[in-house]
Structures are given as structure tokens and as C-alpha cells.
């Protein structure tokens, strides 16, 4: 058993049929010594008495809010949550496996630049009685500070018969050095509580591996005289690290016909312009990637040819 926060405790349980559970000692937070009784949740049925109470915790019916009383007055509360371990593996019932980039990916994180700011998100089908708490650091043995905000519901989607809820959080490394080579990874830890079930999820990464630039901005077409060719130009996204001479991007320019089956013409360039043939009803799209490190491509920025 360990304390998650004041008066909230997590009991770690091996979860199998007829498991004996854990013996947990509750102590009433009071100077009183005598006449103390204990109840569980809203029940008026007395569980036991004494300043300390030893309880057997083996199922969710044993979790909940234990309250000690004296003469009708509430003295203190202890909320017990359960963390299940089945076959040596902690349960992951609350969050959905996003399966990208690999199985058992519950947290996904991205950074728009090297400033030390990043966003993580996760998915669940649970809509109520759900709380999240996020902590982060650079390294784990001698951790350096990363400050995370509160997790918020960022999207709702319908997937077949189910509703899916996306939560996200923004974090910022306290003393980020954008140009420095990373040697210790960022660690992100999410505590999830659904009703009386506790779970925790972790992710470990280097900022350089989660970089995904915003799409190029100000995408424009300039027809070339007496030609089917156009000059496409764009700019670095505002959110990208500066100076651009050091934090450089490479770009992919694509000409796509109206039909997805039509052949795509692609051009790769380090410049912020390219000359391409603009076919009727086609569109031109440009995306960006860090020039010196193969992290994710940005989403496409697009304009129609006409």
C-alpha cells in the first residue's frame, strides 16, 4: 500500500481466483483513543472499532472510503483504490491501446519544435468517474524538472457503437536547451483512476524522436508564363525552432489528381519553393520534416491547382 495523495491510498493486489488479498492497517487521524468506530462508504453498518483497524482487501468491494467516527462525529477518511496485477502484469483497463507505433502504446507524444514543449494524448471509452494526473521529468535517477498542466478532454469520436474520448496534456521542460544533444530521455507518467481502480501508464522518449513540425505556412502558387508549370512557394511554420539556418527543414511537394488512384508526382527539396506541373483538378500539397533527423513528417498543407 502507498499514498497517492493525502488520505488516498493505492493497494496493490495480485488478482486471481480465491487470492487472499492484502492486509491493510488503517489508522484514524485523531488524538482520540477510545470509542472509535469504522464504516465503509455510505453504509451505516459498523465494520469494526479502535484507533487502528486491520482489513483484508481482496476485491473492489473492499476498496472505497473508510471513515472513522466517534459519537456521531466524523474524525477522518481514508480512500482505498485497487491496482490489479494479473499474471505479473499491471492492468491496463482504463486506456485504449493505440497500437501505433507498436502494440501496448497507451500514451502518444509529439513536439512541434525543440523548445522542450510537448503534448501527450491518450484514448479511453470511459466517460465518467475518471481522473488523470500527469508527472514528467528528464531522466529518472537524478530527474530534471518538466512541468505538466492538467489533462483535459480534447476530442470525442464515435467508433462503431462506442464513443471514444481523447485526453491530452501539455508539458514544458523547465530548463530546455534546444540545440543540445539529448542523452537522458523524457519520462512521462500518467496516473489514471476510474471509480476505485488505479492504473499508471508511462512513456519514455527523446524530444528529437517525437518531433512533428506544423505544416508549412503561406503555401502559394505562381503560374509560369507560357507553361503548364507553376512555382509553389511556402514558409517555415511559425512554431518551428529558430534560427532556421541551424534548425533546418526538408520538404516534400506532391501533386495529386482528384482521384486517389491517379499517380502522384513527388518532389523533395530543402528550399522553400519548387516548380511542378499543375494538372487540371489537381491539388498541390507540401509537408515538412527535420532535415537532419528522420522524425515524423508534418501534416500536409494544400492548395488547389485551379
Amino acid at each position: 500500500i502507498w499514498e497517492l495523495k493525502k488520505d488516498v491510498y493505492v493497494v496493490e493486489l495480485d488478482w486471481y481466483p480465491d487470492a487472499p488479498g492484502e492486509m491493510v492497517v488503517l489508522t484514524c487521524d485523531t488524538p482520540e483513543e477510545d470509542g472509535i468506530t469504522w464504516t465503509l462508504d455510505q453504509s451505516s453498518e459498523v465494520l469494526g472499532s479502535g484507533k487502528t483497524l486491520t482489513i483484508q482487501v481482496k476485491e473492489f468491494g473492499d476498496a472505497g472510503q473508510y471513515t472513522c467516527h466517534k459519537g456521531g462525529e466524523v474524525l477522518s477518511h481514508s480512500l482505498l483504490l485497487l491496482h490489479k496485477k494479473e499474471d505479473g502484469i499491471w492492468s491496463t483497463d482504463i486506456l485504449k491501446d493505440q497500437k501505433e507505433p507498436k502494440n501496448k502504446t497507451f500514451l502518444r507524444c509529439e513536439a512541434k519544435n525543440y523548445s522542450g514543449r510537448f503534448t501527450c494524448w491518450w484514448l479511453t471509452t470511459i466517460s465518467t468517474d475518471l481522473t488523470f494526473s500527469v508527472k514528467s521529468s528528464r531522466g529518472s535517477s537524478d530527474p530534471q524538472g518538466v512541468t505538466c498542466g492538467a489533462a483535459t478532454l480534447s476530442a470525442e469520436r464515435v467508433r462503431g457503437d462506442n464513443k471514444e474520448y481523447e485526453y491530452s496534456v501539455e508539458c514544458q521542460e523547465d530548463s530546455a536547451c534546444p540545440a543540445a544533444e539529448e542523452s537522458l530521455p523524457i519520462e512521462v507518467m500518467v496516473d489514471a483512476v476510474h471509480k476505485l481502480k488505479y492504473e499508471n501508464y508511462t512513456s519514455s522518449f527523446f524530444i528529437r524522436d517525437i518531433i512533428k513540425p506544423d505544416p508549412p505556412k503561406n503555401l502559394q502558387l505562381k503560374p509560369l508564363k507560357n507553361s503548364r508549370q507553376v512555382e509553389v512557394s511556402w514558409e517555415y511554420p511559425d512554431t518551428w525552432s529558430t534560427p532556421h539556418s541551424y534548425f533546418s527543414l526538408t520538404f516534400c511537394v506532391q501533386v495529386q489528381g482528384k482521384s486517389k488512384r491517379e499517380k502522384k508526382d513527388r518532389v523533395f527539396t530543402d528550399k522553400t519553393s519548387a516548380t511542378v506541373i499543375c494538372r487540371k483538378n489537381a491539388s498541390i500539397s507540401v509537408r515538412a520534416q527535420d532535415r537532419y533527423y528522420s522524425s515524423s513528417w508534418s501534416e500536409w498543407a494544400s492548395v488547389p491547382c485551379s
Epitope: G21, E45, V46, L47, I55, V57, K58, E59
Partner: nanobody
Framework: EVQLVESGGGLVQPGGSLRLSCAAS????????MYWIRQAPGKGLEWVST???????AYADFVKGRFTISRDNAKNTLYLQMNNLKPEDTALYYC????????RGQGTQVTVSS
Amino acid sequence: EVQLVESGGGLVQPGGSLRLSCAASGFAFSNYWMYWIRQAPGKGLEWVSTIKTSGSAAYADFVKGRFTISRDNAKNTLYLQMNNLKPEDTALYYCSRDYAGTVRGQGTQVTVSS
């Protein structure tokens, strides 16, 4: 009519063991939390242990891992396994359907003495 009949008490040396039983009838035993309470000579009733309908237990501080409460719903029977008994465990032990002992049996005497 609710009936609770305790048995299994006796005289035992310090460090010894006893297993108390309580046969219940006249009510839906499996639907109730059940309790062991005791009364030492010249003292009031003292709560010992509780077992919930699920089989999960709670114990008084003085028990310190020495006693184990259990139930057999098929036999409508409550048990208290008492190990490493001490002289201060000497008391009349009751099984009860409520914490206050308002619905309890006649008790079984446990005496721990050398």
C-alpha cells in the same frame, strides 16, 4: 427465530490454538456481515473481528495476525481460528449478527492459562 450457537472454547496454554465455530439458523446467513465479539471478566463487550458477505475480513488491533475469521455459507457456519493465544485473550466469545452484539449467541468460554 434467529439462533447463533457458539462452540470450540476451552482451556489452553499460552501460545496454544483454538478454533471457535458458530452455527447460525433462522435467517439468510450468507446475506449478513458476521462478527466475533468478546467479554473479558469484569469488562464490557469488545469487538474482535468482522467478515463481510464477500468473505473479506477486518480485525481489531490486538489480534495482530493471530486470529483468522472465516465463513462457510453452505453450512451456515462462522469460524474463528485463534493462534498464539495470550492470557489477555481469556474471555467469553460471542458470534453476532451485528457489531453491537444485540443479536448474539450464548457464547463459548476461552481460558488461556498455564
